[in-house]
Interface confidence: medium
């Protein structure tokens, strides 16, 4: 009698199942008194000897390549041998990376975690994934894993953090880049600081008093809103950050407290008051503004 | 641009072990597989291994398991195949590769081994 | 392993004919997953080493002239030089990456 090792599929992708099945064309594999055992190289595989003339492996790797044959025994202690067949796990290369962001979009605030997840649309085995800042690519991480998606993560985002990256999958075949993406860090502004600018170092009635607020650091565009008291005075603009100014022509009723707010759409902030007051100097006859 | 240069020729006795080197430039050395082939005077090309030079890891051909070992340094950007033991058969040219869409696009100039007492 | 056999061991060709190596595979480099064939053809002249020509047993590397084309699926392929210049004298190799690298015996191109 002779024996056959059937392969099905003969020719497996990495990551797929296979069936290994002993025939014996002349006699009935079914028959309980045959026990069949299953061999790679010089290794048994799976259960060792068994009833059962087929041997199911869930995932064959490109490791697993190699020469396979089977053996059966009868009751009488009889050994039958296949010949090796040559398995070769074929490994499919990557193809189609893409990175994304979580949050989505790239825009993420100052201090909140970030992820950047590199996909690849096809692939197998062990696909090492590479993460790089910068269109000149300063290696930030590798994983190693057999998986289409790894991630990188930066648990608390910095404005230095705001750069283009990409990622970089491998297999084997050689690496395949993704797109650069770019992350943008979105700053919440700092408390502004009001100044009071005159022109001259004791401002007059009618002389023209600048009111100039500025957050030192905050994602632009950025409102600043003016206050007298808790009257508004106006708003300016500052579309690509920095300060912003309010020109006032100065009457007597214009002593007390002034404030700034900066607003970039992640919060408010307000500044410290800055009290101005109308002094009268002896023997003068104009008044004057102090603050 | 990039290129792979290999150290210089080496003439060994019987028994010994060298090691050649091969420098990698012009590309970012950890993106790219390298493997390493032999090829015998007059004959033609037989693949020995390949080295991940990222993770350090290394596959071999059967062949060559216990004659072959690679390794890499990345802060230099440079492949390392040692030979042990070496025999007559050894003498031949050994190149390194970079492996591009499965293919070995850059070859370095090669190295030639002679074994010889 | 996969072993690799070329066809003719050598060939002499005159200037400005079609050249042609052909390439057989113990086994398919064709994977219907990606739809890919996995072999490649180099050149080596003596005293060089090898340059790739051909990679996915049809695409072009870059640099390589447009009179050296890759064809084949399967088991069957095919290196041809449409139009042999002087320069193309060499020894050619297929060599398949489907599993660990095997390379054929080379086919050595002489002018006739």
């Known amino acids: 009698a002779e024996l056959f090792l059937i392969a099905s599929p003969s020719h497996p992708t990495e990551g797929s199942p296979v069936t290994l099945t002993c025939k014996m064309p002349f006699l009935q594999s079914s028959d309980a008194q045959f026990q069949f055992c299953f061999f790679r190289d010089t290794r048994a595989l799976g259960p060792g000897w068994s009833s059962s003339p087929k041997l199911q492996i869930a995932a064959m790797w490109k490791e697993d390549t190699g020469s396979y044959w089977c053996e059966a025994q009868t009751m009488a202690s009889k050994v039958l041998r296949s010949r090796r067949s040559q398995i070769n796990v074929h490994r499919v290369p990557v193809a189609d990376v893409s990175l994304e962001t979580q949050p989505p979009g790239g825009q993420v605030m100052e201090g909140d975690r970030l992820v950047l997840i590199c996909s690849v649309a096809m692939g197998t085995g062990d696909i090492t994934f590479l993460w790089y800042k910068g269109a000149v690519g300063l290696n930030l991480q590798s994983k190693t894993q057999r998986s289409l998606t790894a991630e990188y993560e930066i648990p608390s985002v910095r404005e230095s953090d705001a750069e283009q990256y990409y990622c970089v999958a491998e297999n084997g075949y050689g690496p395949s880049p993704s797109g650069l993406v770019s992350i943008t860090v979105r700053i919440p502004v700092s408390r502004p600081i009001l100044m009071l600018r005159a022109p001259r170092a004791q401002a007059a009635v009618e002389d023209v008093l600048e009111l100039h607020c500025e957050a030192l650091r905050g994602s632009p565009p950025i409102l600043y809103w003016f206050y007298h008291e808790d009257i508004t005075l106006g708003s300016r603009s500052a579309p690509s950050g920095g300060g912003a100014s309010f020109n006032l022509s100065l009457t007597e009723e214009h002593s007390g407290n002034y404030s700034c707010e900066a607003n970039n759409g992640l919060g408010a902030q307000r500044s410290e008051a800055v009290t101005l007051n109308f002094t009268v100097p002896t023997g003068a006859r104009s008044n004057h503004l102090t603050s | 641009q990039v290129q792979l240069v290999q150290s210089g020729a080496e003439l060994v006795k019987p028994g010994a072990s060298v090691k050649v080197s091969c420098k990698a430039s012009g590309y970012t050395f950890t993106r790219y597989w390298m493997h390493w082939v032999k090829q015998a005077p007059g004959q033609g090309l037989e693949w020995i291994g390949r080295?991940?030079?990222?993770?350090?890891?290394?596959k071999y051909n059967e062949k060559f398991k216990s004659k072959a070992t690679l390794t890499v340094d990345k802060s230099t950007s440079t492949a390392y195949m040692e030979l042990s033991s070496l025999r007559s058969e050894d003498t031949a040219v050994y190149y390194c590769?970079?492996?591009?869409?499965?293919?070995?696009?850059?070859w370095g100039q090669g190295t030639l081994v002679t074994v010889s007492s | 392993d996969i072993v690799m056999t070329q066809s003719p061991d050598s060939l002499a060709v005159s200037l400005g004919e079609r050249a042609t190596i052909n390439c057989k595979s113990s086994?398919?480099?064709?994977?219907?997953?990606?739809?890919?064939?996995?072999l490649a053809w180099y050149q080596q002249k003596p005293g060089q080493p090898p340059k790739l020509l051909i990679y996915w047993a049809s695409t072009r590397e870059s640099g390589v002239p447009d009179r050296f084309s890759g064809s084949g699926s399967g088991t069957d392929f095919t290196l041809t030089i449409s139009s042999l210049q002087a320069e193309d004298v060499a020894v050619y190799y297929c060599?398949?990456?489907?599993?660990?690298?095997?390379f054929g015996q080379g086919t050595k191109v002489e002018i006739k």
């Open positions: 080295i991940d030079p990222n993770s350090g890891g290394s």
């Open positions: 060599q398949q990456y489907s599993n660990y690298p095997t």
């Open positions: 086994q398919s480099l064709l994977y219907s997953s990606n739809q890919k064939n996995y």
């Open positions: 590769t970079r492996v591009n869409s499965g293919a070995m696009d850059y």
